[in-house]
């Protein structure tokens, strides 16, 4: 059974600066899961309201 | 997401040549943008992908040499520079992004002739 | 590298038949997330790729479902239902699990 997400291709490791990658199946595409104080698409910013 | 290249260029051979993909409606720093290569009447070929976000690059080992991929955030644009230009660098070159390559640029014509 | 074969390099079929076009892998495309990273694109003559499957049998936003795709992790399949003229073309299957990303040298589909 394939979940609705799951780990990236090795080919992005390094698509979230500050956060994990995960695939996300339905939509096809690679996604970020950010760490604490970071949002962003890549979480890319820190967050200032954080 | 639409993806626009740069006009047809007539180049020599040896000198160097660079192509533009201007990207509306996305933001090119939230994906990598690819770059492939189509000789005439011929098969695609990955060249290397640009991560615009912070300039990271990953080039086919063919290309290594030959292609230089840069972009600029502020224009939402990347680049393609190809040097040394000989005839086997005459094709359409095509920039695409996201996963899966769903969107495309028209594609550039560049032919190398004296 | 991942050399992508495409063994006929073209395909004569009679509108509204069917047509299958095979690809195949050096090397599975299988990861270990359960995801097949092969995909299937039709370039139609002076038209830029597009995008038919995704991930071996996913079709794409805006594809008919008369296109389907299934395989293993090495050998693959794109079938045409009830070809159209609109159908011609070159189609290319593509490896997206690994650097350097390759392309299967295409499989021109011309009516009969």
């Known amino acids: 059974v394939v979940s609705h997400f799951n780990d990236c291709p090795d080919s992005h490791t390094q698509f979230c600066f500050h956060g994990t990658c995960r695939f996300l199946v339905q939509e096809d595409k690679p996604a970020c899961v950010c760490h604490s104080g970071y949002v962003g698409a890549r979480c890319e910013h820190a967050d200032l309201l954080a | 997401v639409q993806l626009q290249q740069s006009g047809a260029e007539l180049v020599r051979p040896g000198a160097s040549v660079k192509l533009s993909c201007t990207a509306s409606?996305?933001?090119?720093?939230?994906?990598?943008m690819h770059w492939m290569k189509q000789r005439p009447e011929q098969g695609l070929e990955w060249i290397g992908r640009i991560d615009p976000a912070n300039g990271n690059t990953k080039y086919a080992p063919k290309f290594q040499d030959k292609a230089t991929m840069t972009a600029d955030t502020s224009s939402n644009t990347a680049y393609l520079q190809f040097s040394s230009l000989t005839s086997e660098d005459t094709a359409v070159y095509y920039c695409?992004?996201?996963?899966?390559?769903?969107?495309w640029g028209q594609g550039t014509l560049v032919t190398v002739s004296a | 590298d991942i050399v992508m074969t495409q063994a006929a390099p073209s395909v004569p079929v009679t509108p509204g038949e069917s047509v299958s076009i095979s690809c195949r892998s050096s090397k599975s495309l299988l990861h270990r997330n359960g995801n097949t990273y092969l995909y299937w694109f039709l370039q139609r003559p002076g038209q830029s790729p597009q995008l038919l499957i995704y991930?071996?049998?996913n079709l794409a936003s805006g594809v008919p479902d008369r296109f389907s795709g299934s395989g293993s992790g090495t050998a693959f399949t794109l079938r045409i239902s009830r070809v159209e003229a609109e159908d011609v073309g070159v189609y290319y299957c593509?490896?997206?699990?690994?650097?350097?990303?390759?392309f299967g040298s295409g499989t021109k589909l011309e009516i009969k």
């Open positions: 593509l490896q997206h699990l690994e650097y350097p990303y390759t």
């Open positions: 695409a992004t996201s996963w899966g390559f769903p969107y």
């Open positions: 409606d996305f933001n090119i720093k939230d994906d990598y």
């Open positions: 991930r071996m049998s």
